[in-house]
Amino acid sequence: SERCDDWGLDTMRQIQVFEDEPARIKCPLFEHFLKFNYSTAHSAGLTLIWYWTRQDRDLEEPINFRLPENRISKEKDVLWFRPTLLNDTGNYTCMLRNTTYCSKVAFPLEVVQKDSCFNSPMKLPVHKLYIEYGIQRITCPNVDGYFPSSVKPTITWYMGCYKIQNFNNVIPEGMNLSFLIALISNNGNYTCVVTYPENGRTFHLTRTLTVKVVGSPGGGSGKPIPNPLLGLDSTGLNDIFEAQKIEWHEHHHHHH
């Protein structure tokens, strides 16, 4: 076949997605390699083609877009999984071409499993909060484009294993989680589970990020209070100590 500008395997874009959840993956060509967008390319008569190489295989093969319930589909420059399966892991290639032009790039996609406390091999984004600095928020990341604005999803927030309820200084507010006053005890992993309907089915998105409470921007900081139970009222404490004697940082038991 005619020559194709091959940008190789873009390992900077190591994409990790959770098993059994939707995933939308934009072709990196338009994000990082080409100076024009998909609409321009499409208008110019260029076609975007997707194919993949399974994990531990060398053979490039076309992506099957005829799976039941359109499990894998392409929409403009986005490859959709509704939902992913573990064996979707592999290297994916998007190629833009017509009779006179060709450009392609590959990127790795890893489908990962999570445990009962949302721990997984997923690399987590880190969000810094300033200690005792007034109200600060984190937002459930990377959920844009999964559902239209007319759809109102439900969002449930967790800290580690625990559903966030009865926490004195941490308030779930839809896609946002507000920290009324950030304390050292608020360090940890926070997970949002977003639930939304689509075409007669219900999908879930799980997103975890790490919160690090750091010194205030002016340099001075209040005294840290290294009490991992701070931020829970007595109801929360009762929940935690009910039934089994567990410890806040023990991630194996899922109590709430």
């Epitope: 499993q113 999570k114 009962s116 309820q165 219900t202 879930h204």
Partner: antibody
Framework: QVQLQQSGPELVKSGASVRISCKAS????????MNWVKQRPGKGLEWIGR????????NYNGKFKDKATLTADKSSSTAFMQLSSLTSEDSAVYFC???????????WGQGTTLTVSS | NIVMTQTPKFLPVAAEDRVIITCKAS??????VAWYQQKPGQSPKLLMY???NRYTGVPDRFTGSGSGTDFTFTISSVQVEDLAVYFC?????????FGAGTKLELK
């Protein structure tokens, strides 16, 4: 599509044990919680507990902690509930039901009827 | 344990009636209440979650509302196929608990 297929009806003697199974298909078995719910005529629904097959983690309703033991086999996508020291109070329909971390149940098995005879 | 008190236990209805079932939690459960429908010899089916969110495929004649301790489930115009038992459930905290059920029967 998601399906939870439970084992058939059981007739067992008082004092014995029984193991009920629930075979899942149509979703990633390891990545959702599997719950067990008891239903007796006129007694409504009672949550027994749940298991996360991915790591074997369990939560129990304190009332059933000494009665039920939950396990799961990832290779066959099957969840199990063992009930021990059976009495007539354990005669009921038992359902398995899936939840995705959110504590409500989007898919249910068809139910397994347990009859304990003296 | 959170107790879910559901009323009424029995509800005689005629086709196209408006039906209201209530559920009262013994403590604040935010908006974390689900509603299920169970027909004779069948397993329960999820209708609503987070009090007011209709599960996929559930007709829009079914609605739910409420937060804190008081919750309402409404069928705007009952159809014959809606004759069943309806249960509320709090999905706020462990142990998860259900209401005793409301049986819809023909007048």
């Amino acid at each position: 599509q998601v399906q939870l297929q439970q084992s058939g009806p059981e007739l067992v003697k008082s004092g014995a044990s029984v193991r009920i199974s629930c075979k899942a298909s149509g979703y990633a078995f390891s990545g959702s919680w599997m719950n067990w719910v008891k239903q007796r005529p006129g007694k409504g629904l009672e949550w027994i507990g749940r298991i996360y097959p991915g790591d074997g983690n369990t939560n129990y309703n304190g009332k059933f902690k000494d009665k039920a033991t939950l396990t799961a086999d990832k290779s066959s996508s099957t969840a199990f509930m063992q009930l021990s020291s059976l009495t007539s109070e354990d005669s009921a329909v038992y359902f398995c039901a899936r939840d995705y971390y959110l504590f409500y149940f989007d898919y249910w098995g068809q139910g397994t009827t347990l009859t304990v005879s003296s | 344990n959170i107790v879910m008190t559901q009323t009424p236990k029995f509800l005689p209805v005629a086709a196209e009636d408006r039906v209201i079932i209530t559920c009262k939690a013994s403590q604040d459960v935010s908006n974390e209440v689900a509603w299920y429908q169970q027909k004779p010899g069948q397993s329960p089916k999820l209708l609503m979650y987070y009090a007011s969110n209709r599960y996929t495929g559930v007709p829009d004649r079914f609605t739910g509302s409420g937060s804190g301790t008081d919750f309402t489930f409404t069928i705007s115009s009952v159809q014959v196929e809606d004759l069943a038992v309806y249960f509320c459930q709090q999905h706020y905290s462990s142990p998860l608990t259900f209401g005793a059920g409301t049986k819809l029967e023909l007048k």
